[in-house]
């Protein structure tokens, strides 16, 4: 039995930040679970991890230098990524693992979300005339 995951096909990070919601065909509230977000077609970079246990507070961390936070819904985990760089535009995959109670469960690989990071466009300041000379 595999958990199904739904993600938006594409998100644009205009302000170098984005909310990526991973929706599962599974209620996580009474489970010990590990939800993670992976970057790249080969999912080589683990961007962020949300670890949950119904009797404890959520643990959210990144071991790869990403600025991330996470929120839990009963059938979803939302990853909030900040300070993204343009060169981090890539495809991102949600992964879910149910650790306890047994048996261990994980997900069918999802289609992923392309996160397109737009660089900050600094608008030129309006030109104010200098003080007029008499």
């Amino acid at each position: 039995n595999k958990i199904l995951v739904k993600q938006s096909p594409m998100l644009v990070a205009y302000d170098n930040a984005v909310n990526l919601s991973c929706k599962y065909s599974y209620n996580l509230f009474s489970r010990e679970f590990r939800a993670s977000l992976h970057k790249g077609l080969d999912s080589a970079v683990e961007v962020c991890v949300v670890y949950g246990n119904y009797s404890q507070q959520l643990q959210v961390y990144s071991k790869t230098g990403f600025n991330c936070d996470g929120k839990l819904g009963n059938e979803s985990v939302t990853f909030y990524l900040q300070n993204l760089y343009v060169n981090q535009t890539d495809i991102y995959f949600c992964k879910i693992e149910v650790m306890y109670p047994p048996p261990y469960l994980d997900n069918e690989k999802s289609n992923g979300t392309i996160i397109h990071v737009k660089g900050k466009h600094l608008c030129p300041s309006p030109l104010f005339p200098g003080p007029s000379k008499p």
Epitope: S25, Y26, N27, F29, S30, Y54, P101, P103
Partner: antibody, heavy 120, light 107 residues
Framework: VQLQQSGAELKKPGASVKVSCKAS????????IHWIKLRSGQGLEWIGW????????QYNAQFKGKATLTADKSSSTVYMELTGLTPEDSAVYFC??????????????WGQGTLVTVSA | DIQMTQSPSSLSASVGDRVTITCKTN??????LAWYQQKDGKSPQLLIY???HLVEGVPSRFSGSGSGTQYSLTISSLQPEDFGNYYC?????????FGGGTKLEIK
């Protein structure tokens, strides 16, 4: 799915009894088996569960030292041994399979029950 | 441990009546609750899981509702075969306690 329990037992106080629950119709190592006690005129009491896939066990604190759960994978059987029997242990004992309904648990399959009577 | 308070402990009703049994918990169990029917000498039968989901094959006169710490089982139109004992059970961690039970008798 079938859970076939062993037959009724009559035991003396202080003795032990081992109740069996033989599973069939599914992959034995993929499901948790719960044990439940039903005393005459009283309600259902949860004893604990056993997971044959990894031998994980959870007990109700009230039954620690009283009940011991084990399994034999070769015969797809889970056992519950009760020790130091007293008249309060006289009850019908059920095994039941836990199913995971997309993250919500329930017990849809039950054994027929085993009556244990403790009497001098 | 989670305490389950089931009420009433017994009830007598007539065929065709609408009957409601309630189960209260001392903390939020997030709908991780099941309801069972048990008749004398028989094994319990699962009626409802996840607080509101009817098990396949169970008559639609049975329904479950509630969330948080308050849950109920309703039989919309009581039938003669509905007599017996009813139990709620939570699955929010262990011990997976049962409610004290409700003995339903047909008038």
């Amino acid at each position: 799915v079938q859970l076939q329990q062993s037959g009724a037992e009559l035991k003396k106080p202080g003795a032990s009894v081992k109740v069996s629950c033989k599973a069939s119709g599914y992959t034995f190592t993929e499901y948790i088996i719960h044990w439940i006690k039903l005393r005459s005129g009283q309600g259902l009491e949860w004893i604990g569960w056993f997971y044959p896939g990894s031998n994980d066990i959870q007990y109700n604190a009230q039954f620690k030292g009283k009940a011991t759960l084990t399994a034999d994978k070769s015969s797809s059987t889970v056992y519950m041994e009760l020790t130091g029997l007293t008249p309060e242990d006289s009850a019908v004992y059920f095994c039941a399979r836990r199913d995971d309904f997309s993250g919500y648990d329930a017990l849809p399959y039950w054994g027929q029950g085993t009556l244990v009577t403790v009497s001098a | 441990d989670i305490q389950m308070t089931q009420s009433p402990s017994s009830l007598s009703a007539s065929v065709g009546d609408r009957v409601t049994i309630t189960c209260k918990t001392n903390e939020n169990i997030y709908s991780n609750l099941a309801w069972y029917q048990q008749k004398d000498g028989k094994s319990p039968q699962l009626l409802i899981y996840a607080a509101t989901h009817l098990v396949e094959g169970v008559p639609s006169r049975f329904s479950g509702s509630g969330s948080g710490t308050q849950y109920s089982l309703t039989i919309s139109s009581l039938q003669p075969e509905d007599f017996g004992n009813y139990y709620c059970q939570h699955f929010w961690g262990t011990p997976a306690t049962f409610g004290g039970g409700t003995k339903l008798e047909i008038k």
